[in-house]
Interface confidence: low
């Protein structure tokens, strides 16, 4: 063991006074006590008594459910962490004399910290929000507001935002626009069909009428070779009040691009709140 006076002789007292050094430089896995270096206790053991000039450091193994995870001079071992099942915790890895017990959360819960001292119930995403990332044992559910064209009408820890129903693919029309919390409401396209069919029918009738007029003209042709009298173009009048005439197709007013997405009060980001065990 190197004593302080010896160091003073070796390095020079003046040098020590100008550049104060530790009384002695102990090696790795040693500690300084009473101006001498003693061995640290190895992991899994605690210190019973410091070394002296004549004796080595005395160490004792940690007891059941205790541990020390470093080379140390601790006089007491640490208690293994207790994974309290009443608090939603369970043992992920049993502790040894050199390692602590690692706790994790029961199914449906996640740790709030790396140390996993607490568990929180996986957060549910409120209506208007969908699950972006499902919770794991160490991370909470990540929610995101449903963008325009998507909705969520439930509070869920698993459901993503669903796309609005496409009425067109079902040969239906949008009767009520969707929001971030509600789907669009589709309905039969009676009005639309009428708007399309009626002009077609009248178009056909008009064509038939033209053909009839043409046939009539041909039938009236004189048989002699006299020059044709100059014919005035025949004016065909359609009454203005015919259904479908002069009727503009209705503009389907949609809120695409301007759906209000409102962050619900109290949602983080509880938090919910979240339930936490």
């Amino acid at each position: 063991m190197v004593r302080l006076p010896l160091q003073c002789v070796l390095w020079g007292c003046l040098l020590t006074a100008v550049h104060p050094e530790p009384p002695t430089a102990c090696r790795e896995k040693q500690y300084l006590i009473n101006s001498q270096c003693c061995s640290l206790c190895q992991p899994g053991q605690k210190l019973v008594s410091d070394c002296t000039e004549f004796t080595e450091t005395e160490c004792l193994p940690c007891g059941e459910s205790e541990f020390l995870d470093t080379w140390n001079r601790e006089t007491h071992c640490h208690q293994h962490k207790y994974c309290d099942p009443n608090l939603g915790l369970r043992v992920q890895q049993k502790g040894t004399s050199e390692t602590d017990t690692i706790c994790t959360c029961e199914e449906g819960w996640h740790c709030t910290s790396e140390a996993c001292e607490s568990c929180v119930l996986h957060r549910s995403c409120s209506p208007g929000f969908g699950v972006k990332q499902i919770a794991t044992g160490v991370s909470d559910t990540i929610c995101e507001p449903c963008p325009v064209g998507f909705f969520s009408n439930v509070s869920s820890a698993f459901e993503k935002c669903h796309p609005w129903t496409s009425c067109e693919t079902k040969d239906l029309v949008v009767q009520q626009a969707g929001t971030n919390k509600t789907d669009v409401v589709c309905g039969p396209q009676d009005r639309l069909r009428a708007l399309v069919v009626i002009p077609i029918i009248f178009g056909i009738l008009f064509a038939i009428l033209l053909v009839l007029v043409f046939i009539k003209k041909v039938a009236k042709k004189p048989t002699n070779k006299a020059p044709h009298p100059k014919q005035e173009p025949q004016e065909i009048n359609f009454p203005d009040d015919l259904p479908g005439s002069n009727t503009a197709a209705p503009v389907q007013e949609t809120l695409h691009g301007c759906q209000p997405v409102t962050q619900e009060d109290g949602k983080e980001s509880r938090i919910s709140v979240q339930e936490r065990q």
Epitope: T112, L121, S272, V273, E275
Partner: antibody
Framework: CQSVEESGGRLVTPGTPLTLTCTVS????????MRWVRQAPGKGLEWIGV?????NTYYATWAKDRFTISKTSTTVDLRIASPTTEDTATYFC??????????????WGPGTLVTVSS | DVVMTQTPSSTSAAVGGTVTIKCQAS??????LAWYQQKPGQPPKLLIY???DLASGVPSRFSGSRSGTEYTLTISGVQREDAATYYC????????????FGGGTELEIL
């Protein structure tokens, strides 16, 4: 406006069961943990227990067999099974603001006074 | 359950002065500590959470700090309206939400 209000506090004789009600407005009990705290006249605050958003209840060790917390969609009840004179206090209901920190309550009711006397 | 030992039980300060209130946790509570202010006839009001975060609407003269298991509330530049009783509330961030209040510190403004 988010608020909580306690009711049901009155003068009771020892042993007569009593239920206090905390009515919440402006937020949902399915999103927050709620706590009950009491304060005896001239004394400090004492934590009784909580009810989680899922409806799980947790009590202080001393309160376990004496109090029961339950809830509906808009109310949280605290039942005192068999009040003693030591239960004379103002009872507060409070919302736990963040689920990851059990100590932090942002909204408190004004309290309701329970007097137990023969 | 955790035990919170709050000191002093009462203190006084002049307007503009500084007040320090301490809370010692019987074991590690990982910064799960809040400070509350209570005036007579009123419910407690949250001042500090997570040991050092200032609650919404609370003046910046209130601050909190932590050193191991000792937590401190400091009021710098005390105002007359700060006369109240202050409580710490510590607890485990666990499912049981088990918490304990300190005994309280009554602050008198001279």
């Amino acid at each position: 406006c988010q608020s909580v209000e306690e009711s049901g506090g009155r003068l009771v004789t020892p042993g007569t069961p009593l239920t206090l009600t905390c009515t919440v407005s402006g937020f949902s009990l399915s999103d927050y943990v709620m706590r009950w705290v009491r304060q005896a006249p001239g004394k400090g605050l004492e934590w009784i227990g909580v009810i989680s958003s899922a409806g799980n209840t947790y009590y202080a060790t001393w309160a376990k067999d004496r109090f029961t917390i339950s809830k509906t969609s808009t109310t949280v009840d605290l039942r005192i099974a068999s009040p003693t004179t030591e239960d004379t206090a103002t009872y507060f209901c409070a919302r736990i603001w963040r689920p990851d920190d059990p100590t932090n309550s942002d909204i408190w009711g004004p309290g309701t006074l329970v007097t137990v006397s023969s | 359950d955790v035990v919170m030992t709050q000191t002093p039980s009462s203190t006084s300060a002049a307007v503009g002065g500084t007040v320090t209130i301490k809370c010692q946790a019987s074991e590690s509570i990982s910064s799960s500590l809040a400070w509350y202010q209570q005036k007579p006839g009123q419910p407690p009001k949250l001042l500090i959470y997570y040991a050092s975060d200032l609650a919404s609407g609370v003046p910046s003269r209130f601050s909190g700090s932590r050193s191991g298991t000792e937590y401190t509330l400091t009021i710098s530049g005390v105002q007359r309206e700060d006369a109240a009783t202050y409580y710490c509330l510590g607890g485990y961030a666990t499912a049981a939400y088990r918490t304990a209040f300190g005994g309280g510190t009554e602050l008198e403004i001279l």
